[in-house]
């Protein structure tokens, strides 16, 4: 589709005569008829196959034709066509005299013709005007012409329809040849595919508008290059979606089981050495002078009553010192300079000579002890606390502080390791002498039934097109990570099928 444009510039008819030679009365009121047709080697009468147009009266005898394209479009004359421009044409321009106001062919006498010119040739589509001048015996016509494409038509012969658009079916302008030129940020045959944010992962990201990066399931981050770990993963990471690879010191399905309580919590006080002994379990080895599960209790070395024979104990920074009563000496006042003659036995104790009177021994009544029966019986000396419990004197009574896993007055009762339901996923717990044992239901294993061993959802290779399969352990389902160019829950659909399907 295009327009053949003819611009009449000047007509000269100095004598004001018709083609017959007869003069016009009073002058030649001149108008033009134009016939555009297919190429003819010899231009002959017949249908104006490309179109026809007439002008009003433009002047009398000789005149210049005003460019009137802005005021109604009479000059240049427009001859539109709705076909592919063939590149060749024939043109007939007739100048007529109008005696009255009726310019219809049937209203004019045949001898009203002033002049007739006919040309033919090649003409390419373009903006440039071709200037021509045709002279007859009595007249001269100067004109120019060109062929341009109609709006939205492009190419050498105006055959390519192209309309710029900026909606979801295309974002482009039209090039002179009618090809599309994508607007910035768009690509594809019809410029409807956005160019994603630079660096947006080809497989894991996509976009619906330029410079965007939207993540496919299982991926996150500005460029969709960070995997999303398994839901509930506490102290772990992933290298592919839905994984939970535990950080050092953590275990379990969700990496929420503390395997390094010592490092994470530093429970041992006063410089004690901490040893991990299982999940959330530890043992503190106390430095001298400290006691307690966490070595939190400062131990007075005099608490064990090391001084004998009534010696008094004094705590010192590096230990203790015994102040011995008269008649005794030694680190613990264990050596006596007394004999039974000195009545050394207190609290009704009876004295017995030894080594020919060089030494003695006291036989103490109940509730008293010591080499001189000077001490009330320490109820802890018999070590009544079982299973490593710590005995503490509390005035007239005593009590046992039990190690983890034991209870009772004398720590004689073994706390059931099963009491806190350590077996996961419905496992059955059995108490053993040195701990516990879990009997796991089908589909689970491990010391605490924490390892899922159910049928791998990926075992059946459900993903197509070389996609990577991941098992979602919490739901026994699979997730397919598609390679570039494929989508769908199983990556079964190629992106960008051609418009016509083969089926």
């Amino acid at each position: 589709s295009g327009v053949f444009q003819l611009q009449l510039q000047e007509f000269i008819n100095e004598r004001g005569v018709l083609a017959s030679g007869r003069p016009c009365e009073p002058g030649c009121r001149t108008f033009f008829r134009v016939c555009l047709k297919h190429f003819q080697a010899v231009v002959s009468p017949g249908p104006c196959t490309f179109g026809t147009v007439s002008t009003p009266v433009l002047g009398t005898n000789s005149f210049a034709v005003r460019d009137d394209s802005s005021g109604g479009g009479r000059n240049p004359l427009q001859l539109p066509f709705n076909f592919t421009w063939p590149g060749t044409f024939s043109l007939i321009i007739e100048a007529w005299h109008a005696p009255g106001d009726d310019l219809r062919p049937e209203a004019l006498p045949p001898d009203a013709l002033i002049s007739k010119i006919a040309i033919q040739g090649s003409l390419a589509v373009g903006q440039n005007w071709l200037l021509d001048e045709q002279t007859s015996t009595l007249t001269r016509l100067r004109y120019s012409y060109r062929v341009i494409c109609s709006d939205n038509y492009y190419g050498d012969n105006c055959s390519r329809l192209c309309k710029k658009r900026n909606d979801h079916f295309g974002h482009y302008v039209c090039q002179p040849d009618g090809n599309l030129s994508c607007l910035p940020g768009w690509t594809g045959e019809y410029c409807q595919q956005p160019i994603c944010l630079s660096g947006c992962h080809e497989q894991n990201g996509y976009c619906s508008k330029p410079a965007e990066c939207l993540c496919r399931p299982g991926w996150q981050g500005r460029l969709c290059n960070e995997c999303i770990p398994h839901n509930g993963c506490r102290h772990g990471t992933c290298s592919t979606p839905w994984q939970c690879t535990c950080d050092e010191g953590w275990g379990g399905l969700f990496c929420d089981q503390d395997l390094n309580y010592c490092t994470h919590h530093s429970p041992c006080k006063n410089g004690a050495t901490c040893s991990n002994s299982g999940q959330r379990s530890y043992t503190c080895t106390c430095r001298p002078g400290y006691t307690g599960v966490d070595c939190e209790l400062e131990l007075s070395e005099c608490d064990s009553n090391p001084c004998r024979n009534g010696g008094s104990c004094k705590d010192q920074e590096d230990g203790y010192h015994c102040l011995c009563p008269p008649g005794y000496y030694g680190l613990h006042c264990e050596h006596s300079t007394l004999s039974c003659a000195d009545s050394p036995c207190f609290n009704g104790g009876s004295c017995r000579e030894r080594n020919q009177g060089a030494n003695y021994a006291c036989e103490c009544p109940p509730n008293f002890t010591g080499s001189n029966c000077e001490k009330k019986v320490d109820r802890c000396t018999s070590n009544p606390c079982a299973n490593g419990g710590q005995c503490l004197n509390r005035g007239p009574s005593r009590m046992c502080r039990c190690r983890p896993g034991f209870t009772g007055t004398y720590c004689e009762l073994h706390v059931s390791d099963c009491a806190r339901n350590p077996c996961a996923h419905g496992g059955t717990c059995h108490d053993l002498e040195n701990g516990l044992m879990c009997t796991c239901p089908a589909g689970f294993s491990g010391r605490r039934c924490e390892v899922r061993t159910s049928i791998d959802a990926c075992a059946s290779s459900p993903c197509f097109n070389r996609a990577t399969c991941y098992t979602d352990l919490s739901t026994d389902t699979f997730v397919c990570n598609c390679p570039y160019g494929f989508v769908g829950s199983r990556c079964e659909f190629p992106v960008g099928l051609p418009p016509s399907f083969p089926w």
């Epitope: 709006d151 939205n152 329809l161 309309k163 710029k164 658009r165 900026n166 909606d167 979801h168 079916f169 295309g170 594809g188 045959e189 019809y190 409807q192 595919q193 996509y206 976009c207 619906s208 508008k209 939207l214 989508v487 769908g488 659909f493 190629p494 992106v495 960008g496 099928l497 051609p498 418009p499 399907f501 089926w503």
Partner: antibody, heavy 121, light 106 residues
């Protein structure tokens, strides 16, 4: 040959939400060459474009319905859906799903057979 | 909002030419489509991108679009062409249908 089939309830109460699904067979909804849309036609009246969606999830809605419309796509099921909330009797219409072809300048070359939805208490 | 205006009805004798117009502001700068809908049936695309015919559509259907008006022409109209015809265009990202023209073959 691609085919589209609408499904959903034929009767919806006023103020409730109209929900329809379009199942695509004979072709992939994930093709980059197509958009998938909804058009409705009240009894005895003309066609009204509701909106459309790309397989990536990008949506485009009629401004006059935008506040009430949601169109979604499920590529794994080869389906797309329409939800229209707070319906009134004026939403009674035959609802069509259709495929818009990018290579045809956005013209709809395939339509479902349509489903009549009546809004009435 | 963008509007497309069509005459409500057009009557034509069998074998004659029916012309249906569709007017909208600068419609010639947009691609116009035409759909045919017979009673109780879904619409069928008969013209896309102003003047192109989908496969299976008879040659008697033709289209043009310039200025503010798109035209669907049915030359040698047949009784089977009696139907409602809708023009359609895209205004930015919004689909717009004309009000429809009922073509009656006398």
């Amino acid at each position: 040959e691609v085919q589209l089939q609408e499904s959903g309830p034929g009767l919806v109460k006023p103020s409730e939400t109209l929900s329809l699904t379009c199942t695509v067979s004979g072709g992939s909804i994930s093709s980059s060459s197509y958009y998938w849309g909804w058009i409705r036609q009240p009894p005895g009246k003309g066609l009204e474009w509701i909106g459309d969606i790309y397989y990536t999830g990008s949506t485009y809605y009629n401004p006059s319905l935008k506040s009430r419309v949601t169109i979604s796509v499920d590529t794994s099921k080869n389906q797309f859906s329409l939800k229209l909330s707070s319906v009134t009797a004026a939403d009674t219409a035959v609802y069509y799903c259709a495929r818009y072809d990018v290579s045809l300048g956005g013209s709809s070359d395939h339509w479902g057979q349509g489903t009549l939805v009546t809004v009435s208490s | 909002s963008y509007e497309l205006t069509q005459p409500p009805s057009v009557s034509v004798s069998p074998g004659q030419t029916a012309s249906i117009t569709c007017s909208g502001q600068r419609l010639g700068d947009k691609y116009a489509s035409w759909y045919q809908q017979k009673p109780g049936q879904s619409p069928v695309l008969v013209i896309y991108e102003d003047s192109k015919r989908p496969s299976g559509i008879p040659e008697r259907f033709s289209g043009s679009n310039s200025g503010d008006t798109a035209t669907l022409t049915i030359s040698g109209t047949q009784p089977m062409d009696e139907a409602d015809y809708y023009c359609q265009a895209w205004d930015r990202d919004t689909g717009v249908f004309g009000y429809g023209t009922k073509v009656t073959v006398l």
